[in-house]
């Protein structure tokens, strides 16, 4: 014969628990019905009736099979600072992130309570670790060899270009600038016009390795004057 | 719905300490209350500590109080309990359970249960 399926609410066997979006209510001391996300318990369950739920109000919600007694607040609306990436509904909170540009410095259960702008490395610092959701940018002196010239929060230190003949050499904020050493070539509308490096450097999107691997341009500088390479004019 | 695994019992001495563990998987459990229940042989389950939901409140049963310590790391999504100047008394299968936003301690009811982990005191 097959074992009698037990309706809400119901006293369980000792030792045994309550069966999948069932609990066991103390005070009635049986198994009842839990209330299902979006709604909460409006009359508790008693040795001889069971769980009666009831929709969450607006701006509250339950996102848990439950039995609480009222739904919970949604959260405030977000902030300046930040996105709402899910919105309040009977299921579910408001969860707030910060917007771009900026990091999450005290985070709640989901979602962040307080937003920070991400740091911004000065000339003569590089980014050493990016920001993240949750993280600052980090910031560390440009490298022997290397250089950034920028205010940023994602710029790293960049190798200075190397030059045959150096006119100014680089420093942690700024850029070797070489000595033309063969005929100016055009370039496009708009291009910084600097004297042609022998090699020009790719756009690194990642942090130069510490310590710096890159040529010192103060190696590069000639012994003395020299006369421009010919064909060139000077600028 | 959330699932839940204790650990962390042994045999130990009169006076003796151990830190019970009891990990969440399937929900967060930042958003229950917890509880650690025991039953001894022959004996009740009873509730031996809670913590709320919010985190704001803890309850001892006033057998354990001043020696047991109940605390949640919500980044491991994991109940402690933390029991010193154990006695033969303590001697219990220990097990957690989950109230879903539960405010108060001790809980209205009862969630989930774990399969418990035992924990000896003797000499």
């Known amino acids: 014969l097959p074992a009698q399926v037990a309706f809400t609410p119901y006293a369980p066997e000792p030792g045994s628990t309550c069966r999948l979006r069932e609990y066991y209510d103390q005070t009635a001391q049986m198994c009842c019905s839990k209330c299902s996300p979006g709604q909460h318990a409006k009359v508790f369950c008693t040795k001889t009736s069971d769980t009666v739920c009831d929709s969450c109000e607006d701006s509250t919600y339950t996102q848990l099979w439950n039995w609480v007694p009222e739904c919970l607040s949604c959260g405030s609306r977000c902030s300046s600072d930040q996105v709402e990436t899910q919105a309040c509904t009977r299921e579910q909170n408001r969860i707030c992130t910060c917007r771009p540009g900026w990091y999450c410095a005290l985070s709640k259960q989901e979602g962040c309570r307080l937003c920070a702008p991400l740091r911004k490395c000065r000339p003569g610092f590089g980014v050493a670790r990016p920001g993240t959701e949750t993280s600052d940018v980090v910031c560390k002196p440009c490298a022997p060899g290397t250089f950034s010239n920028t205010t940023s929060s994602t710029d790293i230190c960049r190798p200075h270009q190397i030059c045959n003949v150096v006119a100014i050499p680089g420093n942690a904020s700024m850029d070797a600038v070489c000595t033309s050493t063969s005929p100016t070539r055009s370039m496009a509308p708009g291009a910084v016009h600097l004297p042609q490096p022998v090699s020009t450097r790719s756009q690194h999107t990642q942090p130069t390795p510490e310590p710096s691997t890159a040529p010192s341009t103060s190696f590069l500088l000639p012994m003395g004057p020299s006369p421009p390479a010919e064909g060139s004019t000077g600028d | 719905e959330v699932q839940l695994v204790e650990s962390g019992g042994g045999l130990v001495q009169p006076g003796g300490s151990l830190r019970l563990s009891c990990a969440a998987s399937?929900?967060?459990?930042?958003?229950?209350?917890v509880a650690w229940f025991r039953q001894a042989p022959g004996k009740e389950r009873e509730e031996v500590s809670c913590?709320?939901?919010?985190?704001?409140?803890?309850n001892y049963a006033d057998s354990v109080k001043g020696r047991f310590t109940i605390s949640r790391d919500n980044s491991k999504n994991t109940l402690y309990l933390q029991m010193n100047s154990l006695r033969a008394e303590d001697t219990a299968v220990y097990y957690c359970?989950?109230?879903?936003?539960?405010?108060?301690?001790?809980?209205?009811?009862?969630?989930?249960w774990g399969q418990g982990t035992l924990v000896t005191v003797s000499s």
């Open positions: 359970t989950t109230e879903p936003y539960g405010s108060s301690c001790p809980l209205s009811g009862y969630d989930t």
């Open positions: 913590i709320t939901y919010s985190g704001g409140s803890t």
């Open positions: 399937g929900s967060r459990l930042d958003y229950y209350a």
